[in-house]
């Protein structure tokens, strides 16, 4: 197996911040879901992964490795560009594929070398190697020389939560199964919380029996189910009391911006 | 019930090859539902993840940086085993060495050890 | 590598009273869903070591329920709810969040 390529991070431009929120700590907040977020850590000079907990926090907190790089280092944006030109395609776009250790049942895409493609193929849920993207948007980004691109491929992506694909320790567990929406759930615009409380139970893809609760939005409660270890979405909790904490306040109106408290 | 047992020479001189062999029964090598490692302890550095195999579509396998150079694990489909062999051995490589099976299923962990085997590395 | 610290490294018990040991990861081993790329083993005198706690949180086959895992992001906790006798030997934690698989230095539980 070849070895993975080393961050590149240090190189990119000069290190002062870009806004004044990127120099400010990584602030979980005071509620206790575990959302997996980014911030800009200004001594490392890179962005870093922590986990929010899903209310209040600062502005040095992004979805995406990506979205807080784009907006935090200095000269990031041309550095990618030079990237997916062809001109300087990472090292990991050349690693094989590698499902990884586990075997959880996740949709993801890789660079494939031979046929010089972004292609999907099923990722195990732990470990593996960095050629291993959440998006096929985001691998042909990042791997593709956009000479080569194929057309775009129209699948739905039900990634609400998308994390950075690149890394080794992605593990942001994509459902290829779409399950429709319930008719008695509200509609978005209606509910003012985090997106994910709005998605029906999903029990995954293993084999495991762990019980969890979801936000069941039609009812205004937080319901139990089994959870089978890996896969599903977000609208999964370990406790009723997170559950409620995270999505119950969402259908308050609320003056601080639809953040749950 | 998944039992591994381990066999080898328990005395290596300085600068020869360590070599061990973990025989599986009640699983397959070849599983698609079970990765293969091979993990060491000693006083000085406790559990020491050495590095794994497994077949999914193809074999894959990886090494701890500290011992990449010198280590290969093979599997052996025939004989339902596989192998840890560690070049040019030191007496930092004394300890007791173990494999194990990784449950790639359910449970995501270490689920099952062999025995165990001293091996001291000394002239 | 991910440094798995262990504390305390030793922890004399006694038998019916409850025993708690906690494990940090020098990175966060959560994922969103909640599951943790985190589990606990436990190495009884001259033994191998034995998978206790997979997941972060779930008891593997034929572990008696005392035993309990816990925690999120970095700050791991084994408890068990009341110490029995053969409960002695050393705890490890273990991550498999990326390679290399990293074990903590190991918590000694003996009795008092």
């Known amino acids: 197996l070849s070895e993975e390529a080393d961050d590149t991070d240090s190189e990119l431009g000069s290190m002062k911040p870009l806004h004044t929120f990127c120099a400010m700590k990584a602030d979980d907040g005071p509620c206790k879901a575990m959302i997996r977020s980014y911030f800009f850590n200004m001594y490392t000079h890179q962005c870093e992964e922590f986990i929010y907990g899903g209310c209040e926090g600062n502005e040095n907190r992004f979805d995406t490795l990506e979205e807080c790089k784009k907006t935090c280092i200095p000269g990031y944006e041309k550095t990618a560009v030079k990237a997916a030109s062809g001109a300087e395609r990472p090292d990991f776009c050349f690693l094989e594929e590698d499902p990884g250790l586990c075997r959880g049942y996740m949709k993801r895409y890789l660079y494939n070398n031979q046929t010089k493609q972004c292609e999907r193929f099923v990722y195990g849920g732990c470990l593996g190697n960095r050629n291993n993207f959440e998006t096929l948007d985001e691998c042909k980004k990042i791997c593709e020389n956009p000479v080569h691109s194929p057309s775009p491929v129209n699948e739905v992506q039900m990634s609400d939560y998308v994390t950075d694909g690149n890394t080794v320790t992605d593990r942001s567990t994509v459902n290829n199964i779409v399950v429709p929406q319930s008719p008695k759930v509200p509609r978005r615009r209606d509910y003012r919380g985090r997106p994910w409380c709005l998605q029906p139970a999903d029990s995954g893809l293993c084999k495991a029996s762990e019980r969890r609760f979801y936000y069941n939005s039609a009812t205004g409660k937080c319901h139990r189910f089994n959870y089978t270890g890996c896969g599903g979405n977000n609208n999964n909790f370990t406790t009723r009391r997170r559950c409620l904490r995270s999505c119950k306040t969402g259908l308050i109106k609320n003056k601080s911006k639809g953040v749950v408290k | 019930q998944v039992q591994l047992q381990q066999s080898g020479p328990g005395l290596v001189k300085p600068s020869q090859t360590l070599s061990l062999t973990c025989a599986i029964s009640?699983?397959?090598?070849?599983?698609?539902?079970?990765?293969w490692s091979w993990i060491r302890q000693s006083p000085g550095r406790g559990l020491e993840w050495l590095g794994i195999?497994?077949?999914?579509?193809?074999?894959?396998?990886r090494y701890a940086v500290s011992v990449k150079s010198r280590i290969t694990i093979n599997p052996d489909t025939s004989k339902n085993q596989f192998s840890l062999q560690l070049n040019s051995v030191t007496p930092e490589d004394t300890a007791v060495y173990y494999c194990?099976?990784?449950?790639?299923?359910?449970?995501?962990?270490?689920?099952?050890w062999g025995q165990g085997t001293l091996v001291t590395v000394s002239s | 590598d991910i440094v798995m610290t262990q504390s305390p490294l030793s922890l004399p018990v006694t038998p019916g009273e409850p025993a708690s040991i906690s494990c940090r990861s020098s990175?966060?081993?959560?994922?969103?869903?909640?599951?943790?790329?985190l589990n606990w083993y436990l190495q009884k005198p001259g033994q191998s070591p034995q998978l206790l706690i997979y997941?972060?949180?779930n008891r593997a086959s034929g572990v008696p329920d005392r035993f309990s895992g816990s925690g999120s992001g970095t700050d791991f906790t084994l408890k068990i709810s009341r110490v029995e006798a053969e409960d002695v030997g050393v705890y490890y934690c273990?991550?498999?969040?990326?390679?290399?698989?990293?074990f903590g230095q190991g918590t000694k539980v003996e009795i008092k």
């Open positions: 997941k972060g949180s």
């Open positions: 194990a099976r990784w449950h790639s299923d359910k449970m995501w962990g270490f689920d099952d």
């Open positions: 009640g699983d397959s090598v070849s599983s698609n539902s079970a990765a």
């Open positions: 990175q966060s081993l959560v994922f969103s869903f909640g599951i943790t790329y």
């Open positions: 195999i497994y077949k999914r579509s193809k074999w894959y396998n």
């Open positions: 273990q991550q498999y969040d990326s390679y290399p698989l990293t």
